[in-house]
């Protein structure tokens, strides 16, 4: 059968596998005139790898909490027993009611895009529900994922997330929207409002058009022992133990303390949804307690003191001191000042010496003062904040926070490239290519101090010399190196970088980028002398910019050959002179030649060589540039892209054509190598390139 190149390139020729895994087909290739000998195209078939998803693909999350994805929720496997590290999930559509993030990475950063099955097994992929402003009973979220592990076909997966107040939540003991308790001065009365007790999330289980006719009924099952509950000034009692959410919302529920001490009080209740006019309705219910704290009227509330963030390296442990947590309270002993963790960060936990290994959620000022309280950092490198509430047991709780900065154990200043200063400008902005600090992550807050300044220039910020600058200023292109002395083609300076309490030093190298156009072209013939002129080296732009004649100094090379000054005419005495310095004018006058030598001590063949030059011009720093070129044995049939001043002796003799040499210094004919006429791209061109050679 015959197939054309265009059919191949158009993807119209298909290979259908049948039988053994190894095989292929024989073919010949013809362009109409020539036919290639037989070729064999080998095909290896791979067993199809199939991905499968197990697990419930549903996640139940407590409102406002963080829940790790587990293997019960999401478990991928492949028929090839692929390593879980290589089973990759891509988040096609992220959650709407919260966010997905990695426990070991910045929980405040961008949304998670990829994660592996191994990370799911490790419990590192977390879903955090964000509390909405409006109450709800149950909310549903979905994540659309794509599971991939080449060469298997991708598999789409949907992870359903149910956020429900029905769930038993250790971090949220109440099933109500709010159950915060009440503080009341001794012998006085206080209104219990929806700021303290609110069951409107039970109402939210009813579709909104019918919601206004529904209510939540609270039945008091255990009355306060040191005071009385009143609804619309009518006392509640065993014979009248009910009040409604609508009465709460209208501010009609009051607790009146009976006086005689400041002991705790409270009441137990059952709450359930009530249909229109008190009819039964299927819906959520809960049994809970409401705490009432009676406050001494002479009590002075504790005053929180300013807090210094705790700083420690990841994976380590550090004691928390009064610098982090302290209060001024003349009425209370340290043991009476209680802290409660309302929300903990993901970078570690608090523990008490002698209090077991696990996290603690309650502790006292005495624990802090005695050094018993410590923070244990996990592997995360993220800063975090503990939201705490602090109370002396006699005043309403006050919110406090404790910031924890995770310090890197070490930082590294990454220098990807030296700073290149354009020759005619003499100045250049530093960027992340020159200075970037990384620890276990990028450190955008890094600060730098110059500990060894440059010899031939200054560092400037805002046009003024500086010895200190920030990563932010670098990223904004505000930090500039400027040459002040035009005598060196390079410079360097040393900086000390500081990020999150850790420092490291680094040397930044500065080089001047020559304003020089270099065209080496195709290979140059060995044994020939070619003309060095502006088609090969051109500093004309530098000449214009500096209003001077640029000078070149040969620093190195060529290894095989030499740069020479050629005589103007046959009459000029002497042969070619060796050159170590020349000017742009010399190049323009065609006075320079490059004698291309043959590599000694090996068989003739292609070779590489180079010239290293230093380029000078008035008022700008010098720059080092190189001219790299390839060489090959002279081929008389080949057109070269440079003017040849002479060709090898042997070639002249063989050819017997004096015109192929131009001893007068006049250029020979110039021709550029033609582009090979090979079809671009496609299977056919691959075959042509590799099989007709």
């Amino acid at each position: 059968r015959t197939r054309s190149g265009s059919q191949l390139d158009g993807g119209l020729v298909l290979f259908s596998h049948r039988g053994t895994l190894d095989g292929g087909f024989r073919f010949r290739l013809s362009d109409g005139e020539h036919t290639s000998p037989g070729h064999f195209f080998r095909v290896t078939a791979q067993k199809q790898v199939l991905l499968s998803l197990k697990g419930s693909q549903t996640l139940t999350v407590c409102p406002g909490s963080v829940q790790p994805l587990s293997s019960q929720t999401l478990r991928a496997s492949s028929s090839a027993g692929t390593d879980p590290q290589l089973l990759l999930y891509r988040v096609v559509r992220g959650p709407q009611l919260g966010r997905l993030f990695h426990a070991q990475q910045d929980s405040t950063g961008e949304a998670l895009v990829n994660f592996t099955q191994a990370e799911v097994y490790a419990g590192n992929i977390l879903y955090e529900h964000e509390m909405p402003p409006e109450p709800f009973w149950e909310a549903h979220d979905t994540l659309e994922l794509q599971l991939s592990s080449p060469p298997a076909r991708d598999v789409a997966a949907t992870l359903a997330v149910a956020v429900s107040f029905e769930a038993a939540c250790p971090q949220r003991p109440s099933h109500l929207w709010k159950n915060k308790g009440l503080w009341v001065p001794e012998g006085q009365r206080a209104r219990i409002t929806v700021a303290a007790l609110d069951a409107s999330n039970l109402l939210a289980s009813v579709p909104s058009p019918q919601r206004s006719e529904h209510d939540v009924l609270f039945q008091v099952t255990q009355f306060p022992s040191r005071g009385q509950l009143l609804v619309s000034e009518e006392p509640l009692h065993a014979g009248q133990p009910h009040f409604l959410q609508s009465q709460l919302a209208a501010g009609q529920l009051v607790y009146a303390h009976g006086g005689g001490g400041t002991q705790q009080d409270g009441f137990h209740f059952r709450a359930h949804l009530q249909g229109p006019a008190g009819a039964s309705v299927a819906g959520p219910q809960t049994s809970e307690a409401f705490a009432i704290t009676v406050r001494d009227v002479n009590e002075r509330p504790p005053q929180p003191q300013a807090s210094v963030p705790l700083r420690l390296t990841r994976g380590s442990r550090a004691p928390i001191s009064r610098a982090q947590l302290s209060v001024v309270d003349p009425d209370s002993a340290p043991g009476e000042i209680e802290y409660e963790v309302q929300r903990a960060p993901h970078n570690g936990f608090l523990s008490l010496v002698g209090g077991g290994l696990g996290p603690v959620t309650r502790f006292t000022q005495a624990d802090v003062d005695s050094g018993r309280l410590a923070f244990v950092a996990n592997g995360s490198s993220v800063a975090g904040i503990f939201q705490l509430s602090m109370s002396d047991g006699a005043s309403p709780p006050l919110p406090m926070s404790l910031a924890v900065d995770i310090l890197p154990s070490a930082i590294e200043v990454q220098l990807r490239a030296p700073l290149e200063v354009p020759q005619a400008l003499g100045r250049s902005s530093l960027s992340q290519q020159q200075l970037r600090v990384v620890s276990d992550r990028e450190e955008p807050e890094a600060a730098y101090r110059l500990i060894q300044g440059p010899q031939y220039g200054h560092l400037l910020v805002g046009g003024r010399p500086t010895s200190a600058f920030s990563q932010f200023q670098i990223d904004q292109g505000e930090v500039v190196f400027a040459f002040t002395n035009s005598s060196s083609s390079h410079d360097h300076f040393r900086v000390l970088a500081l990020a999150r309490g850790v420092n490291a030093s680094a040397v930044v190298n500065v080089t001047v980028r020559a304003l020089l156009h270099v065209w080496a072209g195709g290979p140059w013939p060995q044994g020939a002398t070619l003309r060095l002129d502006p088609t090969v080296l051109d500093a004309g732009e530098l000449a214009n910019r500096t209003d001077s004649v640029p000078r070149f100094r040969l620093l190195e090379g060529p290894r095989h050959g030499r740069v020479v000054r050629v005589p103007r005419a046959r009459t000029e005495p002497g042969g070619s002179q060796l050159v170590e310095q020349f000017t742009q004018q010399d190049l323009e006058d065609g006075r320079l030649g490059l004698e291309v030598g043959r590599p000694e001590g090996r068989a003739p063949g292609p070779a590489g060589d180079s010239l290293t030059l230093e380029l000078w011009a008035q008022g700008v720093p010098p720059a080092v540039a190189s001219l790299d070129f390839a060489t090959e044995p002279y081929n008389a049939a080949r057109p070269y892209s440079v003017a040849l001043l002479s060709v090898p002796e042997a070639a002249r003799t063989e050819a017997g054509k004096p015109e192929s040499s131009t001893p007068t210094g006049e250029p020979g004919p110039m021709a550029s190598s033609p582009e090979p006429a090979v079809a671009k791209g496609g299977f056919l061109s691959f075959l042509e390139a590799n099989m007709f050679s």
Partner: antibody, heavy 117, light 113 residues
Amino acid sequence: QVQLVQSGAEVKKPGASVKVSCKASGYPFTGYYMHWVRQAPGQGLEWMGWINPNSGGTNYAQKFQGRVTITADESTSTAYMELSRLRSDDTAVYYCAKSWVSWFASWGQGTLVTVSS
Amino acid sequence: DIVMTQSPDSLAVSLGERATINCKSSQSVLSSSNNKNYLNWYQQKPGQPPKLLIYWASTRESGVPDRFSGSGSGTDFTLTISSLQAEDVAVYYCQQHFNTPFAFGQGTKLEIK
């Protein structure tokens, strides 16, 4: 002290309408549903419908649908029950009743409506 | 709609004796959301409006003498007066508050024998 005071007795001709009022005091009027229940002479109690004075929402027994209208005036804490197209079998004592949770906790004294040609 | 049926229609009991009135609903009035039976008992004396005695099938209203008690669940309920007093002569009604229409039983007339 919760009190529900109803308007006086009415005598109406068949086909006419009657509007009975019920003035509430001693509690927040808009916080509780008000129901209407009637009792024909020597007969049992028959529930007619309710109003939520807070939302203005109403619900009527199927039997009275289209003939009964229950309204409430928050400014005077008064509920009204209007029954139209009266028939002789509408002769009854009409009660307003304040419901609390899922029961009728307080009742008006009743209004006798007599329908006679 | 839920239909309420009381038995007997009338009852004569001697003073100091126990009186029992039954009430049957055509469907269950037990709520799954709070496990309460939405059944109430009222007492009506001649020329007076009804008075609440028992709610949620067994909870006595504040101020009601403890000789009155209610029992039952689902569809079958009972009002018991443990020791009949002269002032207990009245008509007794059961009523479902499970859903609308909030129906009453036809009533049971209690007299002294």
